[in-house]
Interface confidence: low
């Protein structure tokens, strides 16, 4: 899977969309998780309704919400009040029993609020010592990592 970058402004909302094959994933719940390091586990943040037929209902964990258009095949994650510590790598997942298929790998980048006193060019990306707590963050800009870009920067 390529990594798709979603950029949002600090304090605002970011919407992450994860398209999928609605036939292949029919009947499956979905989840949004935060990647703990390059090869670490993906820590569950929020998942869709326990009853798949009610997946369209929005579910929240803190300021992260998830909803699933099971007919159209689009999982949408909304992250409100975006903060620097929300920057990092995430995954949209499709659940099947104890298995989890990755629908999309996502890099969330947090841009400084241009109305803030800080340099408007500030950009937070995940760091080695970043704590991986629940994400608190929805879509303004998205792109795929270019070939050759390193999704997880090497650690010293």
């Amino acid at each position: 899977h390529n990594t798709t970058v979603f950029q949002g402004v600090e304090g605002q909302s970011l919407q992450v969309s994860c398209p999928y094959d609605s036939m292949k994933h029919w009947g499956r719940r979905k989840a949004w998780c935060r990647q703990l390091g390059e090869k670490g586990p993906c820590q569950r943040v929020v998942s869709t309704h326990n009853l798949w037929l009610l997946s369209f209902l929005r579910r929240r964990n803190g300021s992260t919400a998830i909803t699933d258009d099971t007919l159209g095949g689009t999982l949408t994650i909304t992250l409100r009040n975006l903060q620097p510590h929300d920057a990092g790598f995430y995954q949209c997942q499709s659940l099947h029993g104890s298995e989890a298929d990755t629908l999309r790998k996502v890099l969330v980048e947090v841009l400084a609020d241009p109305l803030d006193h800080r340099d408007a060019g500030d950009l937070w990306v995940p760091g080695e010592s970043e704590s991986f707590e629940d994400a608190h963050v929805e879509h303004s800009i998205s792109r795929s990592l270019l070939e050759g870009e390193i999704p997880f920067p090497p650690t010293s």
């Epitope: 094959d21 036939m23 292949k24 029919w26 009947g27 499956r28 719940r29 326990n50 009853l51 798949w52 037929l53 659940l95 099947h96 029993g97 104890s98 298995e99 298929d101």
Partner: antibody, heavy 123, light 112 residues
Framework: QVQLVQSGAEVKKPGSSVKVSCKAS????????MNWVRQAPGQGLEWMGR????????NYAQKFQGRVTITADESTSTAYMELSSLRSEDTAVYYC????????????????WGQGTLVTVSS | DVVMTQTPLSLSVTPGQPASISCRSS???????????LHWYLQKPGQSPQLLIY???NRFSGVPDRFSGSGSGTDFTLKISRVEAEDVGVYYC?????????FGQGTKLEIK
Amino acid sequence: QVQLVQSGAEVKKPGSSVKVSCKASGYAFSSSWMNWVRQAPGQGLEWMGRIYPGDGDTNYAQKFQGRVTITADESTSTAYMELSSLRSEDTAVYYCARLLRNQPGESYAMDYWGQGTLVTVSS
Amino acid sequence: DVVMTQTPLSLSVTPGQPASISCRSSQSLVHSNGYTYLHWYLQKPGQSPQLLIYKVSNRFSGVPDRFSGSGSGTDFTLKISRVEAEDVGVYYCSQSTRVPYTFGQGTKLEIK
């Protein structure tokens, strides 16, 4: 109607590989999981793995990991199962089987099966 | 892996009489979406397996209504209300809630 037609019987030497084909017709091949199940003589059924032809996604039983490769050719609606490093214990009938879908939710049951391909491993 | 255990392993029944096969799984087969993916197959002599019951209690198309399935969680049952000569073969329960999919050892049904 749905049909799964498998390739003919094979006799193989220990250490060699075998590739069994399964040609599907009568349904949307790309959007249903295809499974491979084997049955040793006088024994029960054993699931080997599956493929989703639409994107090539596969899952394998741990027992066969590294020895089995399941592929699919969407252009010919054909699934393949290749088993390498054959040993006498691999002598079995190999079946392909499609996963049934029914709404709401997938049933994940194998509703149509191929006729089976007997693979005999003998020196 | 989920282990499926069937009882009895063989069954001899007089035509017209009922038959019952039990299947127990080593862990719950309730999927996170609320469905239970427990199925029953029949393999008649010299044939490929055929689907009888899917998701615990749903008869597959063309399956006579003398076949019924029930159960929940880890305990499931296949019942044949009146056995007929054409019902001979090996019955397998199977789960597809978790990968890898697994089958029971099979129950051989014979006619007395």
